[in-house]
């Protein structure tokens, strides 16, 4: 079995303020079992954007239904983008752990740039 890879195919995405950003992410394997999380930024100060396992993320919707069997698409949409949302977004696979899930592998990141709303 090939080791899981996290694929973020878009190095950068440009979105107009007020629009919806789509951040694409797929994984290449069902193994290991565990959730996906999305972060803005890297390192200890990174900001959690979406956690498949738990939490409330009102601006975020998933592109695919993650409950469906064999789903490997963990792309998200972020609504009502503002300039404050600019940054690099990472799709991160976690491995089921006991008691806590453990970070397994990160995608390469997608840089989100925000274009000002035309006046």
């Amino acid at each position: 079995e090939e080791e899981l890879q996290v694929i973020q195919p878009d190095k950068s995405v440009l979105v107009a303020a007020g629009e919806t950003a789509t951040l694409r992410c797929t994984v290449t394997s069902l193994i290991p079992v565990g959730p996906i999380q999305w972060f803005r930024g890297a390192g200890p100060g990174r900001e959690l954007i979406y956690n498949q396992k738990e939490g409330h993320f009102p601006r975020v919707t998933t592109v695919s239904d993650s409950t469906k069997r064999n789903n490997m698409d963990f792309s998200i949409r972020i609504g009502n983008i503002t300039p404050a949302d600019a940054g690099t977004y990472y799709c991160v696979k976690f491995r089921k752990g006991s008691p806590d899930d453990v970070e397994f592998k990160s995608g390469a990141g997608t840089e989100l740039s925000v274009r000002a709303k035309p006046s």
């Epitope: 079992v33 498949q52 738990e54 939490g55 409950t67 469906k68 069997r69 064999n70 789903n71 089921k96």
Partner: antibody, heavy 119, light 110 residues
Framework: QVQLVQSGAEVKKPGASVKVSCKAS????????INWVRQAPGQGLEWIAM????????HYNQIFKDRATLTTDTSTSTAYMELRSLRSDDTAVYYC????????????WGRGTLVTVSS | DIVLTQSPDSLAVSLGERATINCRAS??????????IFWYQQKPGQPPKLLIY???NLDSGVPDRFSGSGSGTDFTLTISSLQAEDVAVYYC????????FGQGTKLEIK
């Protein structure tokens, strides 16, 4: 961490119905399937059915499809399994279990609810 | 429906020895490169506990003396060096179609 807390033991007469509950915590209830499995005294495991709380999609074991109904209450993160027209051979421990990988497997289990059917 | 048949029904193994439990499916449980077989351990008075998923992958927190192998229709759960706490009933489960369980194998100490 993930917890599934089931309702207490029940004693029912033949022909009656029982509704067992399973309250989930430690994860987003709508993101993972819930399975129901039973085990008669001294016997093996028997899969009853499964439900996706996000859209109430269900799959039933043919043996139970006319007598069992699965439902969920997403406001309380609770799953229910109702079994009708009870017979003495329905006496069993009924388990709920959460599928963490959408693989139609059972990663986390409740402690079980003993249902006794006796006249 | 896929029928799973475990063998043996019961097994007695000395402490420190290898224990092997087999699970045969009535048709292939393989799909898209994965083998949809899972192994559970159940001790008296407790719910089952997932040990192995997709035939050969150790679940979180499971000691590495447990391993799973096989493909297609024939699968094996192996405990490389039996410990006293491994006394339990072991079940295989398939999910190539809707879930079904094997009948269980009772493992005891010789």
């Amino acid at each position: 961490q993930v917890q599934l807390v089931q309702s207490g033991a029940e004693v029912k007469k033949p022909g009656a119905s029982v509704k067992v509950s399973c309250k989930a915590s430690g994860y987003t209830f709508t993101n993972y399937w819930i399975n129901w499995v039973r085990q008669a005294p001294g016997q093996g495991l028997e899969w009853i059915a499964m439900i996706d709380p996000s859209d109430s999609e269900t799959h039933y074991n043919q043996i139970f499809k006319d007598r069992a109904t699965l439902t969920t209450d997403t406001s309380t993160s609770t799953a229910y399994m109702e079994l009708r027209s009870l017979r003495s051979d329905d006496t069993a421990v009924y388990y709920c279990a959460m599928d963490y990988g959408s693989l139609y497997a059972m990663d986390y289990w409740g402690r079980g609810t003993l249902v006794t059917v006796s006249s | 429906d896929i029928v799973l048949t475990q063998s043996p029904d019961s097994l007695a193994v000395s402490l420190g020895e290898r224990a092997t439990i087999n699970c045969r499916a009535s048709k292939s449980v393989s799909s898209s490169g994965y083998n949809y077989i899972f192994w559970y351990q159940q001790k008296p008075g407790q719910p089952p506990k997932l040990l192995i998923y997709l035939a050969s992958n150790l679940d979180s927190g499971v000691p590495d003396r447990f391993s799973g192998s096989g493909s297609g229709t024939d699968f094996t759960l192996t405990i490389s060096s039996l410990q006293a706490e491994d006394v339990a009933v072991y079940y295989c489960q398939e999910s190539r179609e809707l879930p079904t369980f094997g009948q269980g194998t009772k493992l005891e100490i010789k």
